[in-house]
C-alpha cells in the first residue's frame, strides 16, 4: 500500500542532489587548495543529518551546525560582495575580480547554490515530488535555514568596506525581505565594518538616472546609519561594459563615448 | 578615503607641451586604477586616460591617441598626463579620478574625483 505523502507548494528536491553536493565538494576542494583538508563524505553526511527524517517545517539552524563547522572557512573579510536579486552579475563580477568572493564563492554556498532540498519526517528518504515553498508553506523549510544560516555567518565574517550589488531594474531597488535586507544588514558587525558600498546596477541601456537617490536607497542608507556604519551608494550605468573593463581595461570601448 | 590634487595646467601655444600631475593623499594610492577626463565649455566631461593600479596598461581616448602619455608613480602617490603637440580643441579643464575597479567612460560612477586644472590652447 503506498504510503500517504505530504504535497508541498514547492518544487521537490533537485534530481541527483546526494551526487550533485558530493560532486560539487570534490570540485570545489580540488581547485581551492586551502580547502584540501575537507572530506567530503563526512560533509554530504553533515548535510544530509541536517533534514533527513526531520519534519520540513520544522528546521532549525542548530540541524546545519555540524555542516557549519565542517564547512569553516576563511576569507578575506574586507573583499566581500553581497547581493541581492542580481545574482548572475555578482558572480560575473567575482569571477572577473578574482579576490573579492560571494557567498557561492565559499564551499558551502558553492555547495548549495541553485539546489532545492527537503527530506520527510521519519523516514530516511529525500523528498523528491514537493518540498515546502518558503510563502505558502513554511520558512523553517530545510533551504530556507540552510541559506539563512550561511548568510548570517558571511556577513558577521565582513570587515572594513562591504559591497553590495542590488538590481536597479527592480521595483524595490532594496528589499527588506530580501536575504540582504533581513539577515545580512542586520548581522554586519559595526565594530568590524566601516562602510557598506551599495552598487545600484541599472538595466536599461540609455537609464542615466541616479538611482542612488531611490526611497528603497534612502531607507537601506537609514538602517545602515543606525547601525553606526557608514553608507556609500554608486550607479552601475552600463554593467556589461564595466565588467569589460574591469577585465580588460585596455578594451577600446572603456575610453570611448559610445 | 582618497583626496586627488590636479596640478600643471596653464596657457600653452599650439603645439606646444604640458605636464599635469595628480597628487593622492591615502596609503591606499596602489590600489585605486586612475584616469584623467576634460570638459571643454558647454560641452560633456569626456574621458581622456587611463591608468591601471600598477601602471602596466593603459589605454586613450581617440583625439588623443600619440599625443599624451599617462603615467604613475605609486611611490609618490602621484599619476601624470604629459600632453604634446597640443592643440586648440584639447583646450578644457582637466580632472582625474580614482576607481578601485575600473576607470572608462560612461560605465559607472567613480569612487573620487580631483578638483580641475585649467588647460588653454592658442593659435
Known amino acids: 500500500v503506498p504510503r500517504w505523502r505530504q504535497q508541498w507548494s514547492g518544487p521537490g528536491t533537485t534530481k541527483r542532489f546526494p551526487e550533485t553536493v558530493l560532486a560539487r565538494c570534490v570540485k570545489y576542494t580540488e581547485i581551492h587548495p586551502e580547502m584540501r583538508h575537507v572530506d567530503c563524505q563526512s560533509v554530504w553526511d553533515a548535510f544530509k543529518g541536517a533534514f533527513i527524517s526531520k519534519h520540513p517545517c520544522n528546521i532549525t539552524e542548530e540541524d546545519y551546525q555540524p555542516l557549519m563547522k565542517l564547512g569553516t572557512q576563511t576569507v578575506p573579510c574586507n573583499k566581500i560582495l553581497l547581493w541581492s536579486r542580481i545574482k548572475d552579475l555578482a558572480h560575473q563580477f567575482t569571477q572577473v575580480q578574482r579576490d573579492m568572493f560571494t557567498l557561492e564563492d565559499t564551499l558551502l554556498g558553492y555547495l548549495a547554490d541553485d539546489l532545492t532540498w527537503c527530506g520527510e519526517f521519519n523516514t530516511s528518504k529525500i523528498n523528491y515530488q514537493s518540498c515546502p515553498d518558503w510563502r505558502k508553506d513554511c520558512s523553517n523549510n530545510p533551504v530556507s535555514v540552510f541559506w539563512k544560516t550561511v548568510s548570517r555567518r558571511f556577513a558577521e565574517a565582513a570587515c572594513d568596506v562591504v559591497h553590495v550589488m542590488l538590481n536597479g531594474s527592480r521595483s524595490k531597488i532594496f528589499d527588506k525581505n530580501s536575504t540582504f535586507g533581513s539577515v545580512e544588514v542586520h548581522n554586519l558587525q559595526p565594530e568590524k565594518v566601516q562602510t557598506l558600498e551599495a552598487w545600484v546596477i541599472h538595466g536599461g541601456r540609455e537609464d542615466s538616472r541616479d538611482l542612488c537617490q531611490d526611497p528603497t536607497i534612502k531607507e537601506l542608507e537609514s538602517i545602515i546609519s543606525k547601525r553606526n556604519i557608514q553608507f556609500s551608494c554608486k550607479n552601475i550605468y552600463r554593467p556589461d561594459k564595466f565588467l569589460q573593463c574591469v577585465k580588460n581595461p585596455e578594451d577600446s570601448s572603456c575610453t570611448s563615448e559610445i | 578615503d582618497v583626496q586627488l590634487q590636479a596640478s600643471g595646467g596653464g596657457l600653452v601655444q599650439a603645439g606646444g607641451s604640458l605636464r599635469l600631475s595628480c597628487a593622492g593623499s591615502?596609503?591606499?594610492?596602489?590600489?585605486?586604477?586612475m584616469g584623467w577626463f576634460r570638459q571643454a565649455p558647454g560641452k560633456a566631461r569626456e574621458i581622456v586616460a587611463t591608468?591601471?593600479?600598477?601602471?602596466?596598461?593603459?589605454n586613450y581616448a581617440v583625439p588623443v591617441k600619440g599625443r599624451f602619455t599617462i603615467s604613475r608613480d605609486n611611490a609618490k602617490n602621484t599619476v601624470y598626463l604629459q600632453m604634446s603637440s597640443l592643440k586648440p580643441e584639447d583646450t578644457a579643464v582637466y580632472y582625474c579620478?580614482?576607481?578601485?575597479?575600473?576607470?572608462?567612460?560612461?560605465?559607472?560612477?567613480?569612487?573620487?574625483w580631483g578638483q580641475g586644472t585649467q588647460v588653454t590652447v592658442s593659435s
Open positions: 579620478a580614482a576607481d578601485r575597479f575600473a576607470v572608462a567612460s560612461g560605465t559607472h560612477d567613480l569612487d573620487y
Open positions: 591615502g596609503r591606499s594610492f596602489s590600489s585605486y586604477a
Open positions: 591608468i591601471t593600479r600598477s601602471g602596466g596598461s593603459t
